[in-house]
Amino acid sequence: ASTQSPSVFPLTRCCKNIPSNATSVTLGCLATGYFPEPVMVTWDTGSLNGTTMTLPATTLTLSGHYATISLLTVSGAWAKQMFTCRVAHTPSSTDWVDNKTFSVCSRDFTPPTVKILQSSCDGGGHFPPTIQLLCLVSGYTPGTINITWLEDGQVMDVDLSTASTTQEGELASTQSELTLSQKHWLSDRTYTCQVTYQGHTFEDSTKKCADSNPRGVSAYLSRPSPFDLFIRKSPTITCLVVDLAPSKGTVNLTWSRASGKPVNHSTRKEEKQRNGTLTVTSTLPVGTRDWIEGETYQCRVTHPHLPRALMRSTTKTSGPRAAPEVYAFATPEWPGSRDKRTLACLIQNFMPEDISVQWLHNEVQLPDARHSTTQPRKTKGSGFFVFSRLEVTRAEWEQKDEFICRAVHEAASPSQTVQRAVSVNPGLAGGSAQSQRAPDRVLCHSGQQQGLPRAAGGSVPHPRCHCGAGRADWPGPPELDVCVEEAEGEAPWTWTGLC
């Protein structure tokens, strides 16, 4: 058998079984399930004198492990004293020790656990005509218990003859039922099940809570998108309230301006979510000039489920400004997907973080659903960056092999936009001078930024591929490098994926 450390258990008598005039008393410590021999048992008796006796180890027949008992007999004022049994098993490890501290005798009762359960609402979340509360008094040493129901702290006149007691092994359980009319339950009173046992009081309380406990309602207020602000010139802000429990009470959203000037008419939309919660949005058109000049807009939210009114405010972001740098590139052909390509656009070092990203093909803006753009993330410096990804089809690039990634940002000049063109096959197409790049080279991340994509499929570059500085004829930002394949007999610019 392999080495096994012991399990240690205190051995005590019940207090009620020890005569009150006893001058000495014996307690013990069981070490069991250990292998191999021996264990060393020592006792800390505090200020008292005691004699110890460790019985010879016995073998546990099924496992072949050992068990032993050490007994301590103490005399004097043992009732108030705590004793520590210390078991050491050096075969487990030189410092393996288990301490158990306990008194001479165990409490002579196990106190009950009191818990109130309530009957369910119906499927629609409504309360039935009567509500049952069930008080479960469980896990106590059999004995007399007294159950009292309280309503807002006052004793209720309840027929307790329905209380039933059951015994499971050494412990007993009792349950008492209270039936309430819907009117009483909805009146928001607190109901308490109070249990008196062995001179102690135990209780649990409950009350109607569905209307009052919010699930964690959140309110958010967005700033206008740069696209709406600078291109469409019809900016809007949206107040979003989420995680509302559906109820008769309606959400009240009130718009105001810090300047006290009147606000435009807002539009409101309510939507029930799959998880049963309600989402409310209110959209307010704002003046382009008002916004740019720094007006603060406020959305005040009240609802029966909210402990207090919530206010959200928004205004133009303050602080330094920096225009975005835009870099667009295409992934080379991947085996098995000849008729599709992914275009990527890195937009970085802009401040503040508000940015709109668009893709254009044939001078037409592609729907937002076509591309996926990350949320702005902070660079190691003070700016922000985003990635945008667009999947294009062979039909599109054969029609015209030029796609434009455009960033709309307040610091971009002259017209709040910066764009880069990218081609799927740059050698074949008359690609824009804005986006020169060597054929089939790939941008690599040199560790200066977080959040850049890894190689396709999560792979890492080929062992012979290293991230080296891009050539001088390829204009790229300093934190992006070119991945060079050094394998013999292959073209010097072979794509292995993003680093």
Epitope: S218, S256, L310, S313
Partner: antibody, heavy 119, light 110 residues
Framework: QVQLVESGGGLVQPGGSLRLSCAAS????????MTWVRQAPGKGLEYVSI???????WYANWASGRFTISRDNSKNTVYLQIDRLRAEDTATYYC?????????????WGQGTLVTVSS | DIQMTQSPSSVSASVGDRVTITCQAS??????LAWYQQKPGQPPKLLIY???TLASGVPSRFSGSGSGTEYALTISSLQPEDFATYYC????????????FGGGTKVEIK
């Protein structure tokens, strides 16, 4: 001007009950969420309960079951009922007004009423 | 529940000193952090709301800053009447919190 005046405090035995009142003046009570905050002698501020403008209420976990907040806008009064009082409930109880526009804390406090629980 | 942890619990400073008290929330607060000043025998007084907005009648030497989970109250030049206890409060409890106040910071005369 805005005024909140608490009353109903005093010496009470453990297990007893008290009803604290808060008389509001100088503003429209129905427009404001109202809060009770307590402060044990020499200790920090402790939130007890809030009642919103709709009359719905919330309690600190430890207060649920023994504390009941209510309001009567027609009488410009907010109440706090405390049942089965314990020694640890000894504190100054403040009635406080939440700002109207929300999310901004308490802009007016009463002077407080002292509740002493002792046998 | 969002817990508010205030530090230090006390600070000794002299008139004219710059004093900063910090408050850490166990979760991000979207808006609504308030600061209060309390003098012995008086109720608290609102100093700052919405993280950084000065309440009416509060001197400009008081300022509030921070976002997310970290907040600070700064007194740029301590005046004799500023010796008091200061509390932060998470005042935006749509997420119902058990105690919305920090433990307090006592600013004492050095």
């Amino acid at each position: 001007q805005v005024q909140l005046v608490e009353s109903g405090g005093g010496l009470v035995q453990p297990g007893g009950s008290l009803r604290l009142s808060c008389a509001a003046s100088g503003f429209t009570l129905s427009n404001h969420d109202m809060t009770w905050v307590r402060q044990a002698p020499g200790k920090g501020l402790e939130y007890v309960s809030i009642i919103n403008t709709y009359g719905n209420h919330w309690y600190a976990n430890w207060a649920s079951g023994r504390f009941t907040i209510s309001r009567d806008n027609s009488k410009n009064t907010v109440y706090l009922q405390i049942d089965r009082l314990r020694a640890e409930d000894t504190a100054t109880y403040y009635c406080a007004r939440e700002t109207h526009h929300g999310s901004s804390g308490i802009d007016h406090w009463g002077q407080g009423t002292l509740v002493t629980v002792s046998s | 529940d969002i817990q508010m942890t205030q530090s230090p619990s006390s600070v000794s400073a002299s008139v004219g000193d710059r004093v900063t008290i910090t408050c850490q929330a166990s979760e991000s607060i979207y808006s609504g952090l308030a600061w209060y000043q309390q003098k012995p025998g008086q109720p608290p007084k609102l100093l700052i709301y919405d993280h950084s907005t000065l309440a009416s009648g509060v001197p400009s030497r008081f300022s509030g800053s921070g976002s997310g989970t970290e907040y600070a109250l700064t007194i740029s030049s301590l005046q004799p009447e500023d010796f008091a206890t200061y509390y932060c409060q998470h005042a935006d409890y749509a997420h119902h919190s058990d105690n919305v106040f920090g433990g307090g910071t006592k600013v004492e005369i050095k």
